[in-house]
């Protein structure tokens, strides 16, 4: 058993049918010695008396808010949560496996640049009685500071019969140098509590591996005289690291017909302009990627050919 | 990534082309190592990230873009004198560069070159003959060092009398390649920045 926060405790259980469970001793936080009784949740049934209460925690029915009283007055509370270990592996019931970029990916994180700011998100089908708390650091043995905000519900989607909820959090490394070469990964730890179930999820990454630039901005077309060709131009996104001559991007320019089946013409360039043939009803899209370290491509920025 | 490669103009900052070749070569070598050594811990998540140049060179600090010198977090041990030799910089660009930058890059390359050559000698003794260092990568390191044209005493190749542990050597190869790829990215950024200056 360990303390998650004041008066909230996590009991770790080897989870299998007929398991013996864990013996837990609760102590009433009071100078009183006599006349103390214990109850669980809203029940008025007295579970025991005395300054300490010994319980065998086996299942969720044994978890909850234990309260010690004296003469009708509440003295203190202890909330017991359960953390299930199923055959040596901690349970992952609360969050959905996003399966991207690989199986057992519960937390996904992205950064728009090298400033040390990043966003993580996760999915669940649970709508109520759910709380999250997020901590992060650079490295784990001698951790350096990363400050995270509160996790917020960022999207709701309908997936078949189920509703899916996306939560996200923004974090910022306290003293980040955009040009630094990372040797210790960022660690992100999410505590999830659903009713009386506790779970924790972690992700470990280098900022350089989660970079996804914003799409190029100010995408414009300039027709070339007496030609079907157009000059496409664009700019670096505002959120990208500066100076751009140091943090350079490379670009992919795509001409896509109205139908998805039509052949796509693609050109790669390090410049912020390109000359392409604009077909009728086609659209021109441009996306960006770090020129020197191949992390994710940005989403496409698009303009119609006409 | 298989992108069309632009040929640099003759007037272009001469080291840029070499640094681009270096990044391409080390990235290819790392990819090859990860595929060949699939049963070894060779992915970024599995290896210890060690920097053999740590406390010996200061490339990131010495080559920091001027715009980032205002960032407190970037100023660990920054040297501020300006470059006075090295053939990569035309004289009119000299003032844009700090003294230690190119020599620090040169020292990095020299240290990695020695490590890679020592390691290759060990890998050649492996009866499995599983993996060797790409000669192209070693040649590209050499070309960039020559383009940097710094005079420094040659570091003797380390020779080891004890029987090599091939498992450990292959893991060390992965560690070295990951670190060298990161340094090659920094070198490319620096060369690109200098070219634009």
């Amino acid at each position: 058993i360990w303390e998650l926060k004041k008066d909230v405790y996590v009991v770790e259980l080897d989870w299998y049918p007929d398991a013996p469970g864990e013996m837990v001793v609760l102590t009433c936080d009071t100078p009183e010695e006599d006349g103390i009784t214990w109850t669980l949740d809203q029940s008025s049934e007295v579970l025991g008396s005395g300054k300490t209460l010994t319980i065998q925690v086996k299942e969720f029915g044994d978890a909850g808010q234990y309260t010690c009283h004296k003469g009708g007055e509440v003295l203190s509370h202890s909330l017991l949560l359960l953390h299930k270990k199923e055959d040596g592996i901690w349970s992952t019931d609360i969050l959905k496996d996003q399966k991207e970029p690989k199986n057992k990916t519960f937390l996904r994180c992205e950064a728009k640049n090298y400033s040390g700011r990043f966003t993580c998100w996760w999915l669940t089908t649970i709508s109520t009685d759910l709380t999250f708390s997020v901590k992060s650091s650079r490295g784990s043995s001698d951790p350096q500071g990363v400050t995270c905000g509160a996790a917020t519900l960022s999207a709701e989607r309908v997936r078949g019969d189920n509703k899916e909820y996306e939560y996200s959090v923004e974090c910022q490394e306290d003293s980040a140098c955009p040009a630094a070469e990372e040797s210790l990964p960022i660690e992100v730890m999410v505590d999830a509590v659903h009713k009386l179930k506790y779970e924790n999820y972690t992700s470990s990454f280098f900022i350089r591996d989660i970079i996804k630039p914003d799409p190029p901005k100010n995408l414009q077309l300039k027709p070339l005289k007496n030609s079907r060709q157009v000059e496409v131009s664009w700019e670096y996104p505002d959120t990208w690291s500066t100076p751009h001559s140091y943090f350079s991007l490379t670009f992919c320019v795509q001409v896509q017909g109205k139908s998805k089946r039509e052949k796509k013409d693609r050109v790669f360039t390090d410049k912020t302009s390109a000359t392409v043939i604009c077909r009728k009803n086609a659209s021109i899209s441009v996306r960006a990627q770090d020129r020197y370290y191949s992390s994710s491509w940005s989403e496409w920025a698009s303009v119609p050919c006409s | 990534r298989n992108l069309p490669v632009a040929t640099p103009d003759p007037g272009m900052f001469p080291c840029l082309h070499h640094s681009q070749n270096l990044l391409r070569a080390v990235s290819n070598m790392l990819q090859k190592a990860r595929q060949t050594l699939e049963f070894y811990p060779c992915t970024s998540e599995e290896i210890d990230h060690e920097d053999i140049t740590k406390d010996k060179t200061s490339t990131v600090e010495a080559c920091l873009p001027l715009e980032l010198t205002k960032n407190e977090s970037c100023l660990n041990s920054r040297e501020t004198s300006f470059i006075t030799n090295g053939s990569c910089l035309a004289s009119r660009k000299t003032s844009f560069m700090m003294a230690l930058c190119l020599s620090s890059i040169y020292e990095d390359l020299k240290m990695y070159q020695v490590e890679f050559k020592t390691m290759n000698a060990k890998l050649l003794m492996d009866p499995k003959r599983q993996i060797f260092l790409d000669q192209n990568m070693l040649a590209v390191i050499d070309e960039l060092m020559q383009a940097l044209n710094f005079n420094s005493e040659t570091v003797p190749q380390k020779s080891s009398l004890e029987e090599p542990d091939f498992y450990k050597t292959k893991i060390k190869l992965c560690i070295l390649l990951h670190a060298f790829r990161i340094r090659a990215v920094t070198i490319d950024r620096v060369m690109s920045y200098l070219n634009a200056s």
Epitope: D14, W15, Y16, P17, D18, A19, E59, F60, K85, E86, D87, G88, I89, D93, K102, N103, K104, T125 | F39, P41, E46
Partner: antibody, heavy 115, light 112 residues
């Protein structure tokens, strides 16, 4: 004590269907994940499928994906394996089993796919 | 498509020490715990070892398990006639959990 009693096995022609049941008692069935494991005659153990305690997630071996469906009825304390488009290579003893460090197995039920 | 490899058979005379190996990889045994089962003819498998080296109550102490890196082993110290059976190791793969990964199985024969 924990008990898993299996039923539903038998002889079936290729391409036909069969449903296996596993009745649980002696524990809170709705709190635990459950597996199906099979063993072809003279061969080793092969995992078939898993279902979470609440039925929310199901996992299958590639060899049965799209043909077999694992399900549970927590109100009846019963686990099921619906087998469709049966093939000769599905001939095996099928076991249900609890998930956890200490597990409990059903007695096994023989499924023979033969024309 | 077994990923955990065991020797097909091992044998010993009563009283001898018999060991069975189970060889896997970084993503399975290297990252997860190992179980060992005993299966007597015509019966369901019986758990002998869980969490690499833990014995459930009721399992004789002549059975012991260990794990090192990407392989595990089961030892029967002082093998007895009633130990003649098939033995299977089991683990998980970190990418496909909760799918059970079973070993190829080992037939233990007690001679004499």
């Amino acid at each position: 004590q924990v008990q898993l009693v299996q039923s539903g096995g038998g002889v079936v022609q290729p391409g036909r269907s069969l449903r296996l049941s596993c009745a649980a008692s002696g524990f809170t069935f709705s709190s635990y994940g459950m597996h199906w494991v099979r063993q072809a005659p003279g061969k080793g153990l092969e995992w078939v499928a898993f279902i979470r305690y609440d039925g929310s997630n199901k996992y299958y071996a590639d060899s049965v994906k799209g043909r077999f469906t694992i399900s549970r009825d927590n109100s009846k304390n019963t686990l099921y394996l619906q087998m469709k488009s049966l093939r000769a290579e599905d001939t095996a003893v099928y076991y249900c089993k609890t998930h956890g460090s200490h597990d409990n197995w059903g007695q096994g039920t023989m499924v023979t796919v033969s024309s | 498509s077994y990923v955990l490899t065991q020797p097909p058979s091992v044998s010993g005379t009563p009283g001898q020490r018999v060991t069975i190996s189970c060889s896997g990889g970084r993503s399975n045994i290297g990252s997860n715990t190992v179980k060992w089962y005993q299966q007597l003819p015509g019966t369901a498998p019986k758990l002998l070892i869980y969490h690499n080296d833990q014995r459930p109550s009721g399992v004789p102490d002549r059975f012991s398990g260990s794990k090192s890196g990407t392989s595990a082993s089961l030892a029967i110290t002082g093998v007895q006639a009633e130990d003649e059976a098939d033995y299977y190791c089991q683990s998980y793969d970190r990418g496909t959990h909760p799918a059970l990964l079973f070993g190829t199985g080992t037939k233990v024969t007690v001679l004499g």
